[in-house]
């Protein structure tokens, strides 16, 4: 049941608008997307929320909302406002949220905003604002959130921001700002989030972020920075930093030494060639570090004090060795990707007890010693492809109970140790041309996918006999002769629906996969028989 007051409230609901009580004896009025060209006239004085967004309102008269002293949220987004006159919001003493985004404003409506002392959130995004008058926010002492993104600003309106000491979040993204001067945000000591992405910023004053003592999130992504933003050094509370998609070529020594609270750093899509060895020290909250293609890095980084790293990717560099103590610095590491480097010798990773995935493909590794991967009880995936591994200690994999994927393809192996590998589901040995011996399927009861150097080695996994069984399955119900079957196997007849030979063979392979418990490649076929061509030993 509604109280007598709510009946009175609903009688003040403009035509076609949707109105409902807000639970505090005040009224929420939704007049959005009604094609209105002017403000409705018969609004209840008890309105607390008014949504006029997505209409065709092109102008506001002075004092168009008289007596709405309880109004807390006014939405005028998505209209055709080019100008807002002085007095447009007069008397809105309780206004906390004002949404003016997606209009055609060319400058911040200074006079209209004066004395909105309760205003906490102001959206001016997606307009055509190119000018922010110096005193435009001077009366907005309670403002917490300010959106100025997707406008036409070419510089930071530093004077206008001086009065916003309570501001907590601001976005200036998607503008045309090219430089951030020293002390640009000098009075914004409460600011927690600052978005500057998608501008044209090419230079930063060395003290441009001074004063932002509460800042936790800084987004400089998609700009034109060609130097590392050393100005971040005063941001001692910074937790999330983005400067990806810029033109930064190097990250200096001790780059983040002033930002010990960093949890996330996004810096991909920069042409980074060099990284100071101490750049990522003393970041105890950092969990992930990814750096691809920094070709001038020759030494593994010193990660002292960054002990909670869980994922480290450092690919495409020129690292030739790892410190023996690498795992002492990184006891919580779960993923290690050092592919495409010049590693020759490996330390023992056994202190990295939490490692689940190691990728060392495309290096220069020549030997796997007994202690290299000892006791990595959580290791599930190990990629050692495209190295020069000729020697693997017989017990190198003997204490890896969780290992299910092992890739040793394109190495120089002539033998392969099976101890400890009974849990494998994926094994790749292709490209080891000296590895000619057969591997027994009995040693790999869980195997689902195996890639061998030679087709005949797949016969040990039942591929050959199954091929015939499958063929017979295909032929059940038709009158094909065994001779036809052999023609099919040899791919010597035209498949139905005029599919070409290649398509047919692909289908053949897919059906094999479906019916085999083990998918082995290269699978034996007419051009890859189950025979070892080198010594003529016939299996089939």
């Amino acid at each position: 049941g509604s109280s007598p007051r709510s009946g009175v409230l609903l009688r003040g609901c403009p035509t076609h608008c949707h109105c409902e009580p807000d639970g505090r004896m005040l009224l929420r009025v939704d007049c959005s997307d009604l094609g209105l060209s002017e403000l409705p006239s018969n609004l209840s004085v008890f309105t607390s929320y008014l949504d006029l967004s997505m209409n065709n309102i092109s102008q506001l008269l002075p004092n168009p909302l008289p007596s709405l002293r309880f109004l807390e949220e006014l939405r005028l987004a998505g209209n055709a406002l080019t100008y807002i006159p002085k007095g447009a919001f007069t008397g809105l003493y309780s206004l906390k949220v004002l949404m003016l985004q997606n209009n055609q404003l060319r400058h911040v409506p200074t006079e209209a905003l004066q004395n909105l002392r309760s205003l906490q959130s102001l959206r001016l995004d997606a307009n055509h604002i190119s000018y922010v008058p110096p005193s435009c926010f001077s009366g907005l002492h309670s403002l917490r959130h300010l959106w100025l993104d997707d406008n036409a600003l070419t510089e930071i309106p530093v004077q206008a921001f001086r009065s916003l000491s309570a501001l907590q979040a601001m976005t200036l993204a998607l503008n045309k700002i090219h430089h951030i001067p020293d002390y640009a945000f000098g009075n914004l000591s409460s600011l927690v989030v600052l978005h500057l992405h998608n501008n044209r910023i090419h230079s930063l004053g060395k003290k441009c972020f001074d004063g932002l003592h509460s800042l936790e999130t800084l987004d400089l992504n998609y700009n034109n920075l060609d130097e590392f933003p050393t100005a971040i050094r005063t941001l001692s509370n910074l937790k999330e930093l983005g400067f990806h998609s810029n033109n930064i070529r190097s990250i200096p020594e001790k780059a983040f030494v002033g930002n010990p609270s960093l949890i996330t750093i996004h810096f991909y899509d920069n042409p980074i060639q060099f990284v100071g060895r101490s750049a990522f020290q003393h970041l105890p909250e950092l969990r992930t570090l990814t750096l691809n293609g920094a070709s001038q890095i020759t030494e593994f980084p010193d990660l002292t004090g960054t002990a909670n790293l869980e994922s480290l990717t450092l690919t495409g560099a020129q690292i030739s060795s790892l410190p023996q103590t690498v795992c002492n610095q990184l006891p919580n590491l779960q993923v290690l990707d050092l592919s495409y480097n010049l590693l020759e010798d490996l330390p023992s990773f056994s202190v990295c007890q939490k490692l689940q995935k190691i990728d060392l493909r495309h290096n220069e590794i020549y030997e796997i010693k007994v202690d290299t991967f000892q006791q990595l009880l959580s290791l599930r995936s190990l990629n050692l492809a495209w190295n020069k591994i000729a020697i693997i200690h017989p017990n190198a994999f003997s204490t890896l109970p969780s290992l299910i994927k092992l890739d040793l393809s394109s190495n120089l192996l002539s033998s392969f140790p099976i101890t400890g590998l009974h849990g494998l589901t994926h094994l790749k040995l292709t490209g080891n041309h000296a590895l000619q011996s057969l591997i027994s399927s009995e040693n790999f009861p869980e195997l689902k996918v195996i890639e061998m150097p030679y087709a005949y080695q797949c016969c040990a996994f039942g591929v050959c006999e199954n091929a015939y069984k499958i063929s017979n399955q295909w032929n059940k119900g038709d009158n094909s002769s065994m001779d036809d079957l052999h023609k099919k196997d040899a791919g010597m007849f035209q498949a139905q629906d005029e599919r070409d030979l290649e398509d047919f063979l692909l289908d053949f392979e897919e059906d094999l996969k479906a019916l085999h418990s083990v998918q082995c490649s290269p699978s034996p076929g007419p051009f890859k028989p189950c025979e070892h061509l080198l010594d003529g030993w016939l299996i089939r």
């Epitope: 001067p181 002390y183 001074d210 050094r233 005063t234």
Partner: antibody, heavy 118, light 111 residues
């Protein structure tokens, strides 16, 4: 309450070395620049340089570069100004100050009098 | 370096009167809408104390008898009305450019 407490007065001979200190408290020591300013007897104020303790970044007045070294130990919230070879002209009161809004020097230490005389 | 010239070097003002100190810079200290001029008060045997930052912003706890104005190269510190304990030396300082520099000081005496 923000406080900067400087070490006591020093009397030295020309050519001697010296390090004076400035200990900060009541705020995040690593997040604000510490500046050093000198005041020769009966004279005005001269800016020597500054350090951001969180990053060891320093900026010097060219006039003093090479003659003094500014450093900090953030583990004990202390900044230092040191000389390897003092001159008589180094006689002055040396102040440390913490930066404030827009690079102003918002908080000052009580000063350290350094007297260099043979 | 930017040279700051203060005038007068000294002045004597009666309590209740207005004191005006000017500071002229050898080049503009304006940058992107901010004028990087600050004012300090120093009493004998004490460190300087920040009065006004960024030309006209009163530091917390400083009485509003103190005010600052100016832009570019010409700046003014005004004390109105002057009180007896305002006797001190006043310095302007710029940090638009390193090295930051101070004016020579203006000594205010109370009649």
């Amino acid at each position: 309450e923000v406080q900067l407490v400087q070490s006591g007065a020093e009397v030295k001979k020309p050519g001697e070395s010296l390090r004076i200190s400035c200990k900060g408290s009541g705020y995040s020591f690593t997040a604000y620049w510490i500046e050093w300013v000198r005041q020769a007897p009966g004279k005005g104020l001269e800016w020597i340089g500054e350090i951001l303790p969180g990053s060891d970044s320093t900026n010097y007045n060219e006039k003093f570069k090479g003659h003094v070294t500014i450093s900090a130990d953030k583990s004990i919230s202390t900044a230092y100004l040191q000389w390897s070879s003092l001159k008589a002209s180094d006689t002055a009161v040396y102040y440390c100050a913490r930066s404030g809004y827009y690079g102003s020097s918002q908080y000052w230490g009580q000063g350290t009098l350094v007297t260099v005389s043979s | 370096d930017i040279v700051l010239t203060q005038s007068p070097a000294s002045l004597a003002v009666s309590p209740g009167q207005r004191a005006t100190i000017t500071c002229r810079a050898s080049e503009s200290v304006d940058s992107y809408g901010n004028s990087f001029m600050h004012w300090y008060q120093q009493k004998p045997g004490q460190p300087p104390k920040l009065l006004i930052y960024l030309t006209s912003n009163l530091e917390s706890g400083v009485p509003d008898r103190f005010s600052g104005s100016g832009s570019g190269t010409d700046f003014t510190l005004t004390i109105n009305p002057v009180e007896a304990n305002d006797a001190a030396t006043y310095y302007c300082q710029q940090n638009a450019e390193d090295p930051r520099t101070f004016g020579g000081g203006t000594k205010l005496e109370i009649k």
